[in-house]
Every structure is written in structure tokens, then in C-alpha cells.
């Protein structure tokens, strides 16, 4: 970067090279070039010469002033016009950064996705800081009082093998950067209470043309958790609001859920599960589409595919799993 160049003098920033976004800053340049009394000192930002707000302080030093500096990063360097030199002579350069101190991390959440072998901790970091911000996740055993710390720049995966202080822990997050430090509230967890079952997946659907046509949704999970509660939500694709059905589920069988739906409508289905009585849910599964047949049988039929219908006794759909849902706010 610009900081690695050989300098003939130096450049510095007040109040600091990393400062709060929107501040007024001064960049000073002092030449120390042999046999050169600089005629003029020039400042460059990201390779472009600055024209305004430059003040000559003395024979070797000049100042560039910025009001309300809003750029997250900039490369600054300064040059001198020496009397006997045809080209400008480089004095020195510096990378500067502006940003914000971290917000207090909140919504600290730790879950163990079944079969992951890791405790995954996430949090809401708050507003963008624009500068390098590190997070220290503190995990303290409530049984042994031992504390472990994990450094990360976003979320953290902690191997359950490394959690050797029993099953009850306090977890909190410290956020720190050059402009400040904040600490979250403490989250109390029990490892067995934060396991999220292996993903539930809708595999296919069929509509049976009985007196009252009914749609059967087939869905499954590879979980080995005994007591699992699930929700299936569905709606016509033209609707905004979801209908939700709840199930207590034993995944020794493929689940079959029955719905009485309007004819000739395209519906979308999703499912999610949690260990019964526990806090955290899976994210909603991929969107699964199924179109119900018309009530009056017609001659035409379409090929069997992800989103399909025909006019025989049954109408079936199978999932290709390409579409994913908006999973915001699903874990809490």
C-alpha cells in the first residue's frame, strides 16, 4: 500500500489516521529532501491532486484541511516542487480511514445445528462501522467458572468438543475497533436446549380427486431428536398472508399432511421444526410450489415437474429445491 513507500519526510493526520466519520481532519506534510527548499507542496487523495484548503505552515510543512470527511478509506500522499527538479518529488504517503465505534452487540443467539458438532453464535452488530472491527465471544462455564474467548470478525463456530465445562454457559460478545469498545448482555444457555433439528424438507405433493379434492404434502427430516414440533405454512402465490398448520412429529416415517385447497390455484408451502418446547426454530424450508387441478377434468396434461398439474386422478409436484425463502427472524 501507500504506507510502504520510501519517504523523504513524513505525513501525519490529526486527530488520527483512523477517525470518526464526518469529522474535520487535518493532514500535515513535512518535507525532508536533500538540497531542496520546496517551492510548493502538493497533496493527493487516491491519486487526484487537491486544489483547495491547503495552507503553507513554514518552509518545509503544509496542511490540508477537510471538513466533514465521509470517505471510509483514502490513500493520501504529498509531493514537493523542488527548484532544480523537473518532476514533483514524493515526500510520503498514508492510508486513512473513517468510520464509527461499534454499537452494543445485541440479539446474541447460540444454536447447535444438528449434526454440525458446533455451537454457532451470532449477534446483531448494529450499524456498519466501515473500519476493521473485531468481536471477542466470551463463553463462561456456569459449572467450572472457566472462561474461553474466541476472536472473530463476524459469527463464530465453536466445536462442542471444546466446551468441556459442562452444558450450562454464559455467552457474551465484546465489539472493538480503533474508535471504541462495547459489550453485549450475557446470554445463558444449556447445550441441550439450543439444538435445532436437521432440516425438514418437502419432497412432493399430490392432489387426490375425491368427492372433496385434498392435497397431500410429503415431507421428512433426518433428525434423531425424539420430540419435534413443526409448522407448515402455505398460501396462494397471489396472497400476502400465510396459513399455518402445527404438527407434533415422529420422523420415523415420511410425514403426510392433508390440505383442502381451492381448485386451479398455485400454492406455495414451507415447513420448519424445533425440538418440542425449546426456543429456536429451523429456518423455513425452500419454497415448494404446487398447483391444484381444475374441478372439471380436461384432456390436456403437463409433464411431471417441480411445478406441474394434470387432469387425471392425482396431481403431483416434486421439489427441485432451487428457491429459498427469506429466512430473516426465523431463529429467534
Amino acid at each position: 500500500g501507500i504506507t510502504n513507500i520510501n519517504c523523504s519526510g513524513h505525513i501525519w493526520v490529526e486527530p488520527a489516521t483512523i477517525f470518526k466519520m464526518g469529522m474535520n481532519i487535518s493532514i500535515y506534510c513535512q518535507a525532508a529532501i536533500k538540497n531542496c527548499q520546496p517551492r510548493k507542496l502538493h497533496f493527493y487523495k487516491n491519486g487526484i491532486k487537491e486544489r483547495f484548503q491547503i495552507t503553507r505552515i513554514n518552509k518545509t510543512t503544509a496542511r490540508l484541511w477537510y471538513k466533514n470527511f465521509l470517505e471510509p478509506h483514502a490513500s493520501m500522499y504529498c509531493t514537493a516542487e523542488c527548484p532544480k527538479h523537473f518532476q514533483e518529488t514524493l515526500i510520503c504517503g498514508k492510508d486513512i480511514s473513517s468510520g464509527y465505534p461499534p454499537d452494543i452487540p445485541d440479539e446474541v443467539t447460540c444454536v447447535i445445528y444438528e449434526y454440525s458438532g458446533n455451537m454457532t453464535c451470532t449477534w446483531n452488530a448494529g450499524k456498519l462501522t466501515y473500519i476493521d472491527t473485531k468481536y471477542v465471544v466470551h463463553v463462561k462455564s456456569l459449572e467450572t467458572e472457566e472462561e474461553q474467548q474466541y476472536l472473530t470478525s463476524s459469527y463464530i463456530n465453536i466445536s462442542t468438543d471444546s466446551l468441556q465445562g459442562g452444558k450450562k454457559y454464559l455467552v457474551w460478545v465484546q465489539a472493538a475497533n480503533a474508535l471504541g469498545m462495547e459489550e453485549s448482555k450475557q446470554l445463558q444457555i444449556h447445550l441441550d436446549d439450543i439444538v435445532i433439528p436437521s432440516a425438514a424438507v418437502i419432497s412432493r405433493a399430490e392432489t387426490i380427486n375425491a368427492t372433496v379434492p385434498k392435497t397431500i404434502i410429503y415431507w421428512d427430516s433426518q433428525t434423531t431428536i425424539e420430540k419435534v414440533s413443526c409448522e407448515m405454512r402455505y398460501k396462494a402465490t397471489t396472497n400476502q398472508t400465510w396459513n399455518v398448520k402445527e404438527f407434533d412429529t415422529n420422523f420415523t416415517y415420511v410425514q403426510q399432511s392433508e390440505f383442502y385447497l381451492e381448485p386451479n390455484i398455485k400454492y406455495v408451502f414451507q415447513v420448519r421444526c424445533q425440538e418440542t418446547g425449546k426456543r429456536y426454530w429451523q429456518p423455513w424450508s425452500s419454497l415448494f410450489f404446487h398447483k391444484t387441478p381444475e374441478t372439471v377434468p380436461q384432456v390436456t396434461s403437463k409433464a411431471f415437474q417441480h411445478d406441474t398439474w394434470n387432469s387425471g386422478l392425482t396431481v403431483a409436484s416434486i421439489s427441485t429445491g432451487h428457491l429459498t425463502s427469506d429466512n430473516r427472524g426465523d431463529i429467534g
Epitope: 466446551l163 452444558k167 447445550l191 433426518q222 433428525t223
Partner: antibody, heavy 121, light 107 residues
Framework: QVQLKESGPGLVAPSQSLSITCTVS????????IHWVRQSPGKGLEWLGV???????DYKGAFISRLSISKDNSKSQVFFKMNSLQADDTAIYYC???????????????WGQGTSVTVSS | DIVLTQSPASQSASLGESVTITCLAS??????LAWYQQKPGKSPQLLIY???RLADGVPSRFSGSGSGTKFSFKISSLQAEDFVFYYC?????????FGGGTKLEMK
């Protein structure tokens, strides 16, 4: 790293009891279940019992009256005791860990090397 | 108790070939099945868990399939070190049970 090691007497007289200690390292017994499995010479695997992370136990029906499993979390040791041994109890006895968080319920991801037990007078 | 019927009890095959072992459960067990490999004089080693998932460090030539009562285990391209014993294992209910084992022999 994760290790389990069984230590037993090798030879047990008929009608006597068998005591095996499984010493573990690299993980905490407060977080993991320990299963006991045996293998008779030239035979398959037979599950005997388990001590769950919270200290509860379950045993195979045929062994309920003569099998006891306990543990000392602080010493990282699990104790297996079987009474009234007969010749057909001759086998290699294994302790094995269930890593519930990685592999789900009752799946044994690490096994001890086994201790060979011969029941003979 | 849930009975696991594993077949064949022994199978001969050549290097590079594929082999499939089946395991039938006496009642439905969902995906709650594991497969282990056992080398002579060694303890069993986990290969497949949750019926279809590969355990850490296990080569991808091993695979599992099935759910409910019928399960299969496949080795796609046999290596010399694969000619050992294999066991299925149900995790669904206590008492846990194992299949009778399959001995894989080199032709």
C-alpha cells in the same frame, strides 16, 4: 485429542464379577454419553448399556439385574461392573462415546481399543 | 427389540469393483441407522450416520441410502483396505442393536 481407554482384569473366574474402567480424555463426560458394547470371539457386536451425560443409565434387558454403570466426571472415568460371569461372557468389552451434537443420538464416533475378558477357572 | 437383518453375511469381490450391503429393520426406524467398519484386532469405526451422511474423514467411495426399514451401504471402488467387516446399527430405541455383520473378502 479424543481418547477412550478401557482397563480390565483380563481373566475372571466363573460366577465372579467383572470391573472395567473407561478413562477418557479430550472431552468432558458431563457433555457426552458413554455406551458399552462387547464382541464375543468370532461374533458380532452386542450393545450392553449406556450412561447418559446427566448420569442416568439404560441397560439391555438381559443384563439389567447384573450390570451397573457409573462415572466420576471430575476424574473422567466411567465404571462398568457385571456380576455372575459365565463362559459365554468371554468377549472384548468396548466403551464408546456418543457425540450427540455432531452425529445425533446414540451414534458412537470414538471407541476405546477394547479390553479382552476371558471367563475361566 | 429391533432386529437388524444384514445381508449378505459374506461377500467376495475384486479390487475396483462396487459392492452393496443391505440392512433390514424389523420395524421402522426413520433415518436412525449407522454403519461401522471393523478391521481385524481393531475397534469399530463410524462410516455413515443418519442413514446417508458420511462421517468426518471417511472417503467418499462409501455411501449409505434408505430410510424406514430398508437400508443399503455401498462401496463404489474397492481398495485393498476395504476387505474387512461391516456392521449396521440402529439408534432408534433402547436396546440399541447391531446387524450380524458382513465380511468382505477379496476374490
Amino acid at each position: 485429542q479424543v481418547q477412550l481407554k478401557e482397563s480390565g482384569p483380563g481373566l475372571v473366574a466363573p460366577s465372579q464379577s467383572l470391573s472395567i474402567t473407561c478413562t477418557v480424555s479430550g472431552f468432558s463426560l458431563t457433555n457426552y454419553d458413554i455406551h458399552w458394547v462387547r464382541q464375543s470371539p468370532g461374533k458380532g457386536l452386542e450393545w450392553l448399556g449406556v450412561i447418559w451425560s446427566d448420569g442416568r443409565t439404560d441397560y439391555k434387558g438381559a443384563f439389567i439385574s447384573r450390570l451397573s454403570i457409573s462415572k466420576d466426571n471430575s476424574k473422567s472415568q466411567v465404571f462398568f461392573k457385571m456380576n455372575s460371569l459365565q463362559a459365554d461372557d468371554t468377549a472384548i468389552y468396548y466403551c464408546a462415546r456418543n457425540n450427540y451434537y455432531r452425529y445425533g443420538r446414540n451414534t458412537m464416533d470414538y471407541w476405546g481399543q477394547g479390553t479382552s475378558v476371558t471367563v475361566s477357572s | 427389540d429391533i432386529v437388524l437383518t444384514q445381508s449378505p453375511a459374506s461377500q467376495s469381490a475384486s479390487l475396483g469393483e462396487s459392492v452393496t450391503i443391505t440392512c433390514l429393520a424389523s420395524q421402522t426406524i426413520g433415518s436412525w441407522l449407522a454403519w461401522y467398519q471393523q478391521k481385524p484386532g481393531k475397534s469399530p469405526q463410524l462410516l455413515i450416520y443418519a442413514a446417508t451422511r458420511l462421517a468426518d474423514g471417511v472417503p467418499s467411495r462409501f455411501s449409505g441410502s434408505g430410510s424406514g426399514t430398508k437400508f443399503s451401504f455401498k462401496i463404489s471402488s474397492l481398495q485393498a483396505e476395504d476387505f474387512v467387516f461391516y456392521y449396521c446399527h440402529q439408534l432408534y430405541s433402547i436396546p440399541l442393536t447391531f446387524g450380524g455383520g458382513t465380511k468382505l473378502e477379496m476374490k
